[in-house]
């Protein structure tokens, strides 16, 4: 159904990295425009991104309201020059995209390492926090304010002389792990929640080495 | 678990009035939409109204555009159904339903009977 | 409004068969598709929405397919539980509008 010449939106995508969430679609428009609406299940849909001939609408706005809700996004097509006009049913043509909880859904941006102190056997490394666009009280809440305890890094790391990996967890942002005196180490850090299904894990961050020119102490 | 009781139904004369309501527990209500559907004796279902979490959306069927009103008390997790101006074939079960997005029926009352006769 | 239209209005199966039922929709509805079971005075019961998706705590014999116009349930062993009648409904437009019904047997 709808109106001629005009086609339904098809291969909705939610990308999402720390709760900035884009919705995608196709096709590219040929005599049309979109409109899209967002919704929890309450079913108060809220329009966005009106009579746009983009196939992407930022709807982070909406989502960080209460990212443990489940949202659901449509995109309406409207003939480029008519917009009011509509199909057969009386309405324009539309396609929903999947469900999307952003709270066990956004993927998990990749983490930076802020710095590292070594103190005799000791070894601490300290994970950036990193921003979100979720608000509280007027101010950006972090990744750790967001997820709390749900949240937890994986440290790997090795000796620079060999590639004997090993591992440490904290449901914090630092480590504090034994290493050998003398000794310099890299490392990398990977945000995981694990009590997700999907999305769980980040990419690596990238790799640290201690004794290179940025010293033993970074921030 | 999602609990959705029915009453108000009963006995009343055609271009009487009733009111049905729907009380829900077990769920955040005002994050759901919610819907009303009714079964004539011996009959299929048909969708009646449906009303968003805030109470801002209503939508009816056109059998009872002007003559029923859907609303909400987030504060008392309960719907309603304002039925006016009744008439015989009002007559069936009235089912209150939770409805994600306004779209689907994914939890039902028991059923509350309407009946409408002389 | 769009006419749902479901076949065959009865069915009659034995315990352990598979069945289809089908609902055609009178316009395209995209994926916008709900299956329901009803027993026997009492509360129809959601099985499967979005054409395919299956309701938590329904069970996997219980499949939906289909898109567009064209729309089918399956149960693919049927139990003896399973014998009730069964109702799809299309949520693309107000008004929603739900198929006649299709009654399943015990042959």
């Known amino acids: 159904s709808g109106t001629t010449n005009t086609v339904a939106a098809y291969n909705l995508t939610w990308k999402s990295t720390n709760f900035k969430t884009i919705l995608e679609w196709e096709p590219k428009p040929v005599n049309q425009v979109y409109t899209v609406q967002i919704s929890t299940k309450s079913g108060d849909w809220k329009s966005k991104c009106f009579y746009t001939t983009d196939t992407e609408c930022d709807l982070t706005d909406e989502i960080v309201k209460d990212v443990k809700q489940t949202y659901l996004a449509r995109v309406f097509s409207y003939p480029a020059g008519n917009v009011e006009s509509t199909g057969s049913a009386g309405e324009p043509l539309y396609e929903n995209s999947p469900e999307f909880t952003p709270y066990l859904e956004t993927n998990i941006g990749q983490p930076v390492i802020q710095k590292y102190e070594q103190g005799g056997t000791k070894l601490k490394v300290t994970v950036k926090d990193s921003f979100t666009l979720v608000r509280r009280n007027n101010t950006f809440l972090s990744l750790r304010d967001v997820f709390g305890k749900d949240l937890i890094y994986t440290l790997y790391y090795w000796k620079s002389s060999s590639s004997g990996k090993k591992t440490a967890k904290t449901n914090t942002n630092e480590f504090l792990i034994d290493v050998d005196k003398g000794e310099n180490y890299c490392f990398s850090v990977q945000a995981v929640i694990p009590s997700r299904t999907v999305n769980r894990k980040s990419t690596d961050s990238p790799v640290e080495c201690m004794g290179q020119e940025k010293g033993e102490f970074r921030e | 678990e999602v609990q959705l009781l029915e009453s108000g139904g009963g006995l009343v004369q055609p271009g009487g009035s009733l009111r049905l309501s729907c009380a829900a527990s077990?769920?955040?209500?005002?994050?759901?939409?919610m819907s009303w559907v009714r079964q004539a004796p011996g009959k299929g279902l048909e969708w009646v109204s449906s009303?968003?979490?805030?109470?801002?959306?209503?939508y009816y069927t056109d059998s009872v555009k002007g003559r029923f009103t859907i609303s909400r008390d987030n504060s008392k997790n309960t719907l309603y159904l304002q039925m006016n101006s009744l008439r015989a074939e009002d007559t069936a079960v009235y089912y209150c339903?939770?409805?994600?997005?306004?779209?689907?029926?994914?939890?039902w009352g028991q059923g509350t009977l309407v009946t409408v006769s002389s | 409004d769009i006419q749902m239209t479901q076949s065959p209005p009865s069915l009659s199966a034995s315990a352990g068969d598979r069945v289809t039922i089908t609902c055609r929709a009178s316009?395209?509805?995209?994926?916008?598709l709900a299956w329901y079971q009803q027993k026997p005075e009492k509360a129809p019961k959601s099985l499967i929405y979005?054409?395919?998706s299956l309701q938590s705590g329904v069970p996997s014999r219980f499949s939906g397919s289909g898109s567009g116009t064209d729309f089918t349930l399956t149960i693919s062993s049927l139990q003896p539980e399973d014998f009730a009648t069964y109702y799809c409904?299309?949520?693309?437009?107000?008004?929603?509008?739900f198929g006649q019904g299709t009654k399943l047997e015990i042959k």
């Open positions: 339903a939770r409805s994600p997005w306004g779209y689907y029926l994914d939890s």
């Open positions: 077990g769920f955040t209500f005002s994050n759901y939409a």
């Open positions: 009303i968003s979490g805030s109470g801002d959306y209503t």
């Open positions: 316009q395209g509805i995209s994926s916008r």
């Open positions: 979005a054409a395919s």
């Open positions: 409904q299309q949520y693309n437009s107000y008004p929603y509008t």
